[in-house]
């Protein structure tokens, strides 16, 4: 009689991520007695996947009943598969012996390759905001996904960015790879409703890449212009000037009033108006009373914005001529200031 | 007291590179940008570029196109501006500034670097 | 970018006299103007930022005016020791630029 052989008819067997992995094995002859294992790998450090005389695999079955004399099919499925059970798997007969059992024959393995989906990418940007005109980086992650090939893209409010470097590890043989990009994203000053796309295409993922984003609201920071100037008067000896403090961003906002370098009013911004472009408008007014000075008065609008040394505007108010002389004007002389509050 | 203190004068042969340093003192280094600004011998002043090292964001004047790296050194406080295939215009004093884009102009000036280029 | 188009190239004036460097901007820069004082050897010395804002410890005798593309310099009464070049510089839009110069002599 022809001696046994152990037959595995896939060389490879490709399966996603958490489906059922079915590994073939039979044998042409019953003899000799003895049972069928299961390894992941050869030689001496490999695994044991399944074995029919003993043990506890909880996530192994059979293809078929392995306790009836005639069976010649050990067949094996592995459930929930992960990367992690990437690699060649061998079926092997054992013949009976005392006390042990003996090696037999080895089929030739079958290869098991595990396809799994990336991670949702995951893109940050700098840790400190920037401003409009400054090239920043962005980087994008994403993790666990087999095979190797993956494509990654970035994107700027759907315009395609060509700035960018990408790496994928480990670059030799591995279970399961990572993919690490840098992004560099000119800022403007109209990018506060901008968002930085991170797309990443697979082969698992049918044709439906993941994304992941940033919005530019949580790095740029889009310094205000200032601009001082007198009202027409209120009354007989009132003078009411005005600070418009033009397209900022985020919102946080101090405003101080000087009257001749001193502090007269402090106040955060609250009801600012918002523009198209996601950047912020406000206003600050001050009512001078200018029977209560002799001298002309310096009036200075300082502002300090999201944490950055304070900038400030000044405006000479002349108390010789009448108030109602001075009417608007609407050109502010922006006269020498020292408010300077550096950190 | 704000300083910036600059490395000191180099002599390069066209084609080559230099990297000028700039080490900073007396301030939160991550909190303003360091902005390069050159001279040429008897000439008026030229923006190279800057970068804030609180964000890593660069802008660089593109007349260089390409030629000018900059970096910064949180841990020693240092920004530093390579030129590189260098040619003998590039011959000038190289300067290091303080600013806080968009608030303030340049408010604090390093030394000067001179970099002669000349085979 | 931005032409920074300053005048006059230099000029002579007297001790105590007022004088007066203009800069014209080829397209708007709100209020960002900057002018800078340099003596030779040395490194430029901020003076004006904001168009009219006086930086710390400069005397009062330096003032800037202006907005939109057309800014003035001023010095009310010449000193001896404001004999150097002065420079206007934008920095509303990168890169940022400097005027050609102003070269101050006494006469």
């Known amino acids: 009689e022809e001696e046994l052989q152990v037959i595995q008819p896939d060389k490879s067997v490709l399966v996603a991520a958490g489906e059922t992995a079915t590994l073939r094995c039979t044998a042409t002859s019953l003899i000799p007695v003895g049972p069928i294992q299961w390894f992941r790998g050869a030689g001496p450090g490999r695994e044991l996947i399944y074995n029919q005389k003993e043990g506890h695999f909880p996530r192994v079955t059979t293809v078929s009943d392995l306790t009836k004399r005639n069976n010649m099919d050990f067949s094996i499925r592995i459930g929930n598969i992960t990367p992690a059970d990437a690699g060649t798997y061998y079926c092997v007969k054992f013949r009976k012996g005392s006390p042990d059992d003996v090696e037999f024959k080895s089929g030739a393995g079958t290869e098991l390759s595990v396809r799994a989906k990336p991670s949702a990418p995951v893109v940050s940007g700098p840790a400190a905001r920037a401003t409009p005109q400054h090239t920043v980086s962005f980087t994008c992650e994403s993790h666990g996904f087999s095979p190797r090939d993956i494509t990654l893209k970035w994107f700027k409010n759907g315009n395609e960015l060509s700035d960018f470097q990408t790496n994928v590890d480990p670059v030799g043989e591995s279970v399961s790879y990572s993919i690490h990009s840098t992004a560099k994203v000119v800022l403007t000053r109209e990018d506060v409703h901008s968002q930085v796309i991170c797309e990443v295409a697979h082969v698992t993922l049918q044709g439906d890449p993941l994304r992941g984003t940033a919005n530019l609201s949580e790095t740029i920071r889009v310094p205000p212009t200032l601009e001082v100037t007198q009202q027409p008067v209120r009354a007989e000896n009132q003078v009411n000037v005005t600070c418009q403090v033009r397209k900022f961003y985020p919102q946080r906002l101090q405003l101080t009033w000087l009257e001749n370098g001193n502090v007269s009013r402090t106040e955060t911004a609250s009801t600012v108006t918002e523009n198209k472009d996601g950047t912020y408008n406000w206003m600050s007014w001050l009512l001078v009373n200018v029977s209560a000075h002799r001298d002309d008065v310096k009036l200075t609008c300082q502002v300090e914005h999201d944490g950055q040394p304070a900038v400030s505007k000044s405006h000479d108010l002349k108390v010789s001529a009448h108030p109602k002389e001075q009417g608007s004007n609407t050109a502010a002389e922006n006269t020498g200031s020292n408010e300077r509050n550096i950190y | 007291q704000v300083q910036l203190v600059q490395s000191g004068a180099e002599v390069k042969k066209p084609g080559s590179s230099v990297k000028v340093s700039c080490k900073a003192s007396?301030?939160?280094?991550?909190?303003?940008?360091i902005h390069w600004v050159r001279q040429a011998p008897g000439q008026g002043l030229e923006w190279m570029g800057d970068?804030?090292?609180?964000?890593?964001?660069?802008a660089n004047n593109q007349k260089f196109k390409g030629r000018v790296t900059i970096t910064a050194d949180e841990s020693t406080s240092t920004a530093y501006m390579e030129l590189s295939s260098l040619r003998s215009e590039d011959t000038a004093v190289y300067y290091c500034?303080?600013?806080?884009?968009?608030?303030?102009?340049?408010?604090?000036w390093g030394q000067g670097t001179l970099v002669t280029v000349s085979s | 970018d931005i032409q920074m188009t300053q005048s006059p190239s230099s000029l002579s004036a007297s001790v105590g006299d007022r004088v007066t460097i203009t800069c014209k901007a080829s397209?708007?820069?709100?209020?960002?103007v900057a002018w800078y004082q340099q003596k030779p050897g040395k490194a430029p010395k901020l003076l004006i930022y904001?168009?009219?804002s006086l930086e710390t410890g400069v005397p009062s005798r330096f003032s800037g005016s202006g907005s939109g593309t057309d800014f003035t310099f001023t010095i009310s009464s010449l000193q001896p020791e404001d004999i150097a070049t002065y420079y206007c510089?934008?920095?509303?839009?990168?890169?940022?630029?400097f005027g050609g110069g102003t070269k101050v002599e006494i006469k």
């Open positions: 397209e708007d820069i709100y209020d960002r």
């Open positions: 904001g168009t009219a």
């Open positions: 970068i804030h090292p609180g964000s890593g964001g660069t």
């Open positions: 510089q934008q920095y509303w839009t990168t890169p940022w630029t």
């Open positions: 007396g301030y939160t280094f991550t909190d303003y940008e």
């Open positions: 500034a303080r600013a806080v884009s968009g608030y303030y102009a340049m408010d604090y």
